[in-house]
Interface confidence: low
């Protein structure tokens, strides 16, 4: 004998991004020589048994046994979400219902606010927006590997009705560091299976210069020829070199180029040289020692630099 | 000694095209931005296009939009304007200019490095 249970198809529900195909199953096992049909949210049959009942290419038959009717959809809309019912034609007619999602896959994110010349210690606003989510997206921010805290997203139903656009700033104050840094903000969505969606916005930061000089040889002796390359860094690179030594009044103005050249080291050379390096963001002098050595192969470390 | 050179300019009838160059020497420019400027007779020097260091990033002014391409190749440490469709009003000395810093500008202010200029004459 067997149970009414034995009639009752069962099916399962689905989860689709929008876009991709989606297969619904219905089985039963005892099909007391009826056939399996489904039929849409709006209630329009879609197969009955083998045989289509909807022109709608998207629709294709998988499985059409007695005991299974399969059916797949490909290219899903949003519009397709819904309950799908399953129906057996026994009596009474017996339904399951598969319950479709649509997952909306949110747009690349769009990042505005970007103002150019930021300045060392400016504060920086940015803010990212995504559309098209279901359900809405969570954005993030970071800047290189270091997360960045912005405000919480903010969520928009967009005019469909079904999907979403979200919403995020970030506020931070920049340093010399985050000159050429990159500010990603991310979009995290279930549709996007782990999958990175996110938008870079490179930031130039203007910084006041530094430099140091380098002597070249290291330990200068008498005799040698010695260069003295004064390394400016910031942005805008510094463009500007006045090199001085220092002990004179005034200063002993010696040249304007980035490196100071002795073809022929004397002992009279010895002394403290400045190099000012200076860019439209402002100067740095910075400061070095020359004493030259005696023409012995021992090395000294007495000339220093800073 | 930085240099920027352009090329390219010349006389061609409206509806015609050029395509100017510009060469950096002295310095590897590659990591910075490069922008084009021109100048009319008797009118101040005005903005045309501009493109980041790695050319990512282009800009145009409004007269240059859908007419001319900015572009670079930075192994050549060159940077090119193509300019099609080209009218009456676009005959100026365009210069090539640089910034010390890898941001484009918009305004003459933003470069540090200009050009010497080459003239385009656009007349039938």
């Known amino acids: 004998n067997l149970s009414q249970d034995d009639s009752q198809p069962w099916t399962s529900d689905e989860t689709v991004v929008a876009g991709g195909t989606v297969v619904l199953k219905c089985q039963v096992k005892d099909h007391e020589d009826s056939s399996l049909q489904w039929s849409n949210p709006a209630q329009q049959t879609l197969y009955f048994g083998e045989k289509r009942a909807l022109r709608d290419n998207r629709i294709q038959l998988v499985t059409s046994t007695p005991h299974e009717l399969s059916i797949s959809i490909s290219n899903v809309a949003l519009a397709d979400e819904g309950e799908y019912t399953c129906s057996i034609f026994t009596m009474p007619v017996r339904t399951a219902k598969s319950l479709v999602t649509v997952l909306g896959i949110p747009q690349k994110p769009i990042i505005t606010g970007y103002k150019s010349s930021l300045r060392e210690k400016d504060t920086a606003t940015l803010n990212c927006q995504s559309s098209g989510s279901k359900p809405a997206a969570r954005l993030t921010w970071r800047k290189g590997d270091q997360e960045l805290h912005g405000e919480p997203t903010r969520i928009q139903e967009d005019p469909n009705g079904k999907t979403f656009t979200v919403s995020s700033s970030v506020t931070f104050q920049v340093t010399r560091e985050d000159d050429g840094a990159s500010i990603v903000c991310s979009v995290n969505h279930e549709s996007l299976k782990g999958a990175d969606r996110s938008t870079s916005q490179r930031i130039e930061v203007l910084y006041t210069p530094t430099a140091m000089i380098r002597p070249d040889p290291p330990h200068p002796r008498e005799g040698q020829k010695l260069l003295l390359h004064c390394e400016g860094r910031g942005n805008p690179v510094p463009q500007q070199y006045l090199w001085e030594k220092e002990g004179s009044v005034p200063p002993l103005k010696m040249t304007q180029e980035s490196a100071l050249i002795f073809p022929f080291l004397n002992k009279s050379d010895s002394g403290t040289y400045g190099c000012t390096a200076t860019s439209n963001m402002g100067s740095y002098k910075a400061y070095y020692t020359l004493n030259v050595n005696d023409p012995s192969p021992v090395p000294s470390s007495s000339s220093t630099y800073h | 000694q930085v240099q920027l050179v352009e090329s390219g300019g010349g006389l061609v009838q409206p509806g015609g095209s050029l395509r100017l160059s510009c060469a950096a020497s002295?310095?590897?420019?590659?990591?910075?931005?490069r922008g084009w400027f021109r100048q009319a007779p008797g009118k101040e020097r005005e903005f045309v296009a501009a493109?980041?260091?790695?050319?990512?990033?282009?800009n145009y002014a409004d007269s240059a939009k859908g007419r001319f391409t900015i572009s670079r190749d930075n192994s050549k440490n060159t940077v090119y304007l193509q300019m099609n469709s080209l009218r009456a009003e676009d005959t100026a000395v365009y210069y090539c200019?640089?910034?010390?810093?890898?941001?484009?500008?918009?305004?003459?202010?933003?470069?540090?490095?200009w050009g010497q200029g080459t003239l385009v004459t656009v007349s039938s």
């Open positions: 200019a640089a910034p010390a810093s890898r941001r484009p500008s918009w305004d003459a202010d933003g470069y540090d490095y």
């Open positions: 493109i980041d260091y790695s050319g990512g990033s282009t």
């Open positions: 002295g310095r590897t420019f590659s990591n910075y931005a």
